[in-house]
């Protein structure tokens, strides 16, 4: 659910981290209406996720650790 690169809502599905290659943070105070994590998948899809949900936090941390270790 995105429009002009802004997420307008969140996915109701849980994405498995093995399908995700990276993420972008969307901040509500930077031109968009809501805070969101935009997950980028191996199939070049962008998926809007709720940054407050536990599964989203876990994946963000896992991806952040991968970047640190590179």
């Amino acid at each position: 659910a995105s429009n002009f690169d802004c997420c307008l809502g969140y996915t109701d599905r849980i994405l498995h981290p093995k399908f995700i290659v990276g993420f972008t943070r969307q901040l509500a105070n930077e031109g968009c209406d809501i805070n969101a994590i935009i997950f980028h998948t191996k199939k070049k899809l962008s998926v809007c996720a709720n940054p407050k949900q536990t599964w989203v936090k876990y994946i963000v941390r896992l991806l952040s650790k991968k970047v640190k270790n590179m």
Partner: antibody, heavy 121, light 110 residues
Framework: EVQLVQSGAEVKKPGSSVKVSCKAS????????ISWVRQAPGQGLEWMGG????????NYAQKFQGRVTITADESTSTAYMELSSLRSEDTAVYYC??????????????WGRGTLVTVSS | QSVLTQPPSVSAAPGQKVTISCSGS????????VSWYQQHPGKAPKLMIY???KRPSGVPDRFSGSKSGNSASLDISGLQSEDEADYYC???????????FGTGTKLTVL
Amino acid sequence: EVQLVQSGAEVKKPGSSVKVSCKASGGTFSSYAISWVRQAPGQGLEWMGGIIPIFGTANYAQKFQGRVTITADESTSTAYMELSSLRSEDTAVYYCAREDIVGAVDGFDIWGRGTLVTVSS
Amino acid sequence: QSVLTQPPSVSAAPGQKVTISCSGSTSNIGNNYVSWYQQHPGKAPKLMIYDVSKRPSGVPDRFSGSKSGNSASLDISGLQSEDEADYYCAAWDDSLSEFLFGTGTKLTVL
């Protein structure tokens, strides 16, 4: 009614390791995270880390990174927490707790009864 | 050392109302859900409030939660003797990428 059933109390020597188990009785692990929280005598609660079994990968608090390993076996609905290089300060009650990962209830809604780990020479 | 700060103790008479505060920052309370736990001596913690102000089934409506900016509060009205316990606030911290518990507050019912 889902219950988290933990393994029994342990007495360990300094420098050794301990492995505590947590079995989800009457339910499954799907769409939940299992966290481990410890409480030293007379102290507060401390999050050690957690795992989303369907992901298979764990997150750890920086304080315990490298010393704790959290795993889960989906087939038996059991989570494990192993803490190595034990010292006397690790004497504590270790709890497992369940959290809904899609946020229907954002918080640890079900807790195990705790496992007392005593580290003493 | 927790970065969610609570008063060490609060007390009030039965029937009175008490407020327990929890002070944090933008990276935890400001941007994330807050939950509250009650713990009686020798027992496991019990979830009392989640998502700032929601109550799990079975928790009396005497317990309520709120949030303003980087601080959260737990209100307990009509105090009863069984409310005497330790209370902990909790929230995820985006900067640390880990879950934090507050320092804990001992509630005494006089």
